[in-house]
């Protein structure tokens, strides 16, 4: 018979013939041959694979190290890798969350759009005409105004993008 | 910085349980294994077992099965070996460790010295 | 269970002289780790996934090997070298250590 050109899934192809893949969680020691089966061996402790595959050595879990802010979200196991994330107050700074760095916060004048997680920074946001935010805050957002008229008085200082509005007693001279 | 601090030495009769502790710090015990092993005077080192402290998952050598008892306690970041019907021949230092790849050290406590004599 | 036999138990090296310490394992392992150890102390991993030295390790360490066999080396005998060397396989439960080897200076 013709030697086979392709493969079937799960299988690849080494000296002119198909040999089976090495399942998730283990790594290849020896190819098939025309009278063996592929040789597999499961990966160690603290070591994974996570697709099927040829490779002779498994990779190491991801070691989330604490002096960079990280710590883990996920345990790895021998088919999946260990996740980190970043410490309370913390996001990462890449996709691979490698390391972290402190959210920022929004200054006076801004508020916060977008509270930052583990993976993502703060989102701020210009407080509009009619809110305010008087701090530098990684958790708060813009607040309306006071109403004066809802307490029975009137503007006496105007608001601004970082003050809230000043009331003060109805003009009781007026007729 | 990553720490194992074991509990004190501990002389007992044979038949007696010893339990032993290794607090951590530096890290958060339940997102590595906890190893125990056991070093006998001038001889080399026995695994005993291993805890998960996330689930209590455990491994145990065969040798020491059905006398060893791992557990943790996630809250206070510790873990405890407890053996029981003590011979003479436990008389060793028992030591804890990591996950190898904690930090690339492998951090392992200081030892726990028990002494099994009547 | 997988055996794990360590030779030379005991030897003696001079100032300089290349050291090779093996480790043969009853059948294929994933990986092996070696610890050191001096007199009165707790281990240190010593060489972490075979080849890999573990933090604060001389360069004039490595590690090779793969299967059921593995070796560790020291380039070159330093005085500080002197003390007992531990392999250990994590790949099937029960997980377990070589005899040792102890390392002396010449």
């Known amino acids: 018979p013709e030697p086979p050109t392709a493969c079937r899934e799960k299988q690849y192809l080494i000296n002119s013939q198909c040999c089976s893949l090495c399942q998730p969680g283990q790594k290849l020691v020896s190819d098939c041959t025309e009278f063996t089966e592929t040789e597999c061996l499961p990966c160690g402790e603290s070591e994974f694979l996570d697709t099927w595959n040829r490779e002779t050595h498994c990779h190491q879990h991801k070691y989330c190290d604490p002096n960079l802010g990280l710590r883990v979200q996920q345990k790895g196991t021998s088919e999946t890798d260990t996740i980190c994330t970043c410490e309370e107050g913390w996001h990462c700074t890449s996709e691979a969350c490698e390391s972290c760095v402190l959210h920022r916060s929004c200054s006076p004048g801004f508020g916060v759009k977008q509270i930052a997680t583990g993976v993502s920074d703060t989102i701020c946001e210009p407080c509009p005409v009619g809110f305010f935010s008087n701090v530098s805050s990684a958790f708060e957002k813009c607040h309306p105004w006071t109403s004066c008229e809802t307490k029975d008085l009137v503007v006496q200082q105007a608001g601004t993008n970082k003050t809230d509005v000043v009331c003060g007693p109805q003009d009781r001279l007026r007729a | 910085e990553v720490q194992l601090v074991q509990s004190g030495a501990e002389v007992k009769k044979p038949g007696a349980t010893v339990k032993i502790s290794c607090k951590v710090s530096?890290?958060?015990?339940?997102?590595?294994?906890i190893h125990w092993v056991q070093q006998a005077p001038g001889k080399g080192l026995e695994w005993m077992g291993r805890?998960?402290?996330?689930?209590?998952?455990?491994k145990y050598d065969p040798k020491f099965q059905g006398r060893v008892t791992m557990t943790a306690d996630t809250s206070t970041d510790t873990a405890y070996m407890e053996l029981s019907s003590l011979r003479s021949e436990d008389t060793a230092v028992y030591y804890c460790?990591?996950?190898?790849?904690?930090?690339?050290?492998?951090?392992w406590g200081q030892g726990t010295t028990v002494t099994v004599s009547s | 269970q997988i055996v794990l036999t360590q030779s030379p138990t005991i030897m003696s090296a001079s100032p300089g002289e290349k050291v090779i310490i093996t480790c043969s394992a009853t059948?294929?392992?994933?990986?092996i780790l070696w610890f050191q150890q001096k007199p009165g102390t707790s281990p240190k991993l010593w060489i972490y996934?075979?080849?890999n030295l573990a933090s604060g390790v001389p360069a004039r360490f490595s590690g090779s090997g793969s299967g059921a066999s593995y070796s560790l080396t020291i380039s070159r005998m330093e005085a500080e070298d002197a003390a007992t060397y531990y392999c250990?396989?994590?790949?099937?439960?029960?997980?377990?250590f070589g005899g040792g080897t102890k390392l002396e200076i010449k």
């Open positions: 460790t990591t996950s190898y790849y904690v930090g690339t050290y492998g951090y």
């Open positions: 530096g890290f958060n015990i339940k997102d590595y294994y």
């Open positions: 805890i998960d402290p996330e689930d209590g998952d455990t």
């Open positions: 059948s294929s392992v994933s990986y």
């Open positions: 996934s075979t080849s």
């Open positions: 250990q396989q994590r790949t099937f439960y029960p997980y377990t």
